[in-house]
């Protein structure tokens, strides 16, 4: 079920106009310290680095793009779900 949701989000993200994808600064894609429990297990960046990235939405980290994306709560839109629908 979650996999379907992930695929759905990835389709939306990949089909979005470039400005619609909330992508962080390029330098944030550089070397990262490997944190997390267990060998080679990385924590979801949405839980720390991008914890407050989405204003009225939920953060979803798209591994393929190495960038966070926001799923907006009802009535909100924009790359960080900051805009209110009229």
């Amino acid at each position: 079920d979650l996999q379907e949701a992930d695929l759905d989000l990835l389709r939306v993200t990949l089909s979005s106009k470039p400005q619609a994808l909330a992508t962080p600064n390029k330098e944030e894609h550089g070397k990262r310290k490997k944190k997390g429990k267990g060998l080679g297990k990385k924590r979801d960046p949405c839980l720390r680095k991008y914890k407050d990235f989405c204003i009225h939405g939920e953060c979803k980290y798209v591994k393929e793009l190495r960038a966070p994306s926001c799923i907006c709560h009802p009535g909100y839109h924009g790359e960080r779900c900051h805009g209110l629908s009229l």
Partner: antibody, heavy 122, light 113 residues
Framework: QVQLQQSGTELARPGASVKLSCKAS????????ITWVKQRTGQGLEWIGE????????YYNEKFKGKASLTADKSSSTAYMQLSSLTSEDSAVYFC???????????????WGQGTTLTVSS | DIVMSQSPSSLAVSVGEKVTMSCKSS????????????LAWYQQKPGQSPKLLIY???TRESGVPDRFTGSGSGTDFTLTISSVKAEDLAVYYC?????????FGAGTKLELK
């Protein structure tokens, strides 16, 4: 499989408070919203409010502000709704439901709990 | 608040009949960002929890029989059951998720003639 297990029937006195629970399983709790809906006997569905466990954001129907308080415990994948200053008007079945998303937006409820019946009587 | 109006309030049908019910919103539910209508349909049988049938006005939820079809745009929406079965007797609710507060219609009760 996705399941929402709600707490059992509640009987409460006028003026008291109750805390209803909704335990989620079968999916990543923080990825979806949990919404609460009221249904009085023989009546329609009334949206109370919702919580997004991931961000902690809550949204309320103005009518239920001060009446309902929504919280979520990520460690146990459980959402709660506290109802205060109970009156007979609060007697109803309360449903929790998972708020799902597609195309980048949340908004519709794809899995529902079995409902908790609350009776307020002296 | 967005007001959702459903009609008729009740509908008496025979098994095998085609049925349509209406849901109207007090303002457009069309999201300009994705050109989709933020409307869902639910079925509730007596003593049961509601069940999602349709979202984005016309997308059928997984596992829902294809006799259920959602259509419409803007403020006018329709749920059609192409050939009613006895198990379809229930109350049907529409719900908007265009903006808060989320609101439901009063429901259409499908009864046996």
């Amino acid at each position: 499989q996705v399941q929402l297990q709600q707490s059992g029937t509640e009987l409460a006195r006028p003026g008291a408070s109750v805390k209803l629970s909704c335990k989620a399983s079968g999916y990543t709790f923080r990825t979806y919203g949990i919404t609460w809906v009221k249904q009085r006997t023989g009546q329609g569905l009334e949206w109370i409010g919702e919580i997004f466990p991931g961000s902690g954001n809550t949204y309320y129907n103005e009518k239920f502000k001060g009446k309902a308080s929504l919280t979520a415990d990520k460690s146990s994948s459980t959402a709660y709704m506290q109802l205060s200053s109970l009156t007979s008007e609060d007697s109803a079945v309360y449903f929790c439901a998972r708020e799902s998303f597609s195309d980048g937006y949340y908004g519709y409820f794809d899995y529902w709990g079995q409902g908790t019946t609350l009776t307020v009587s002296s | 608040d967005i007001v959702m109006s459903q009609s008729p309030s009740s509908l008496a049908v025979s098994v095998g009949e085609k049925v349509t019910m209406s849901c109207k919103s007090s303002q457009s539910l069309l999201y300009s960002t994705n050109q989709k209508n933020s409307l869902a349909w639910y079925q509730q049988k007596p003593g049961q929890s509601p069940k999602l049938l349709i979202y984005w006005a016309s997308t059928r939820e997984s596992g829902v029989p294809d006799r259920f079809t959602g259509s419409g745009s803007g403020t006018d929406f329709t749920l059609t059951i192409s050939s009613v079965k006895a198990e379809d007797l229930a109350v049907y609710y529409c719900q908007q998720y265009y903006r808060y507060p989320l609101t439901f219609g009063a429901g259409t009760k499908l009864e046996l003639k």
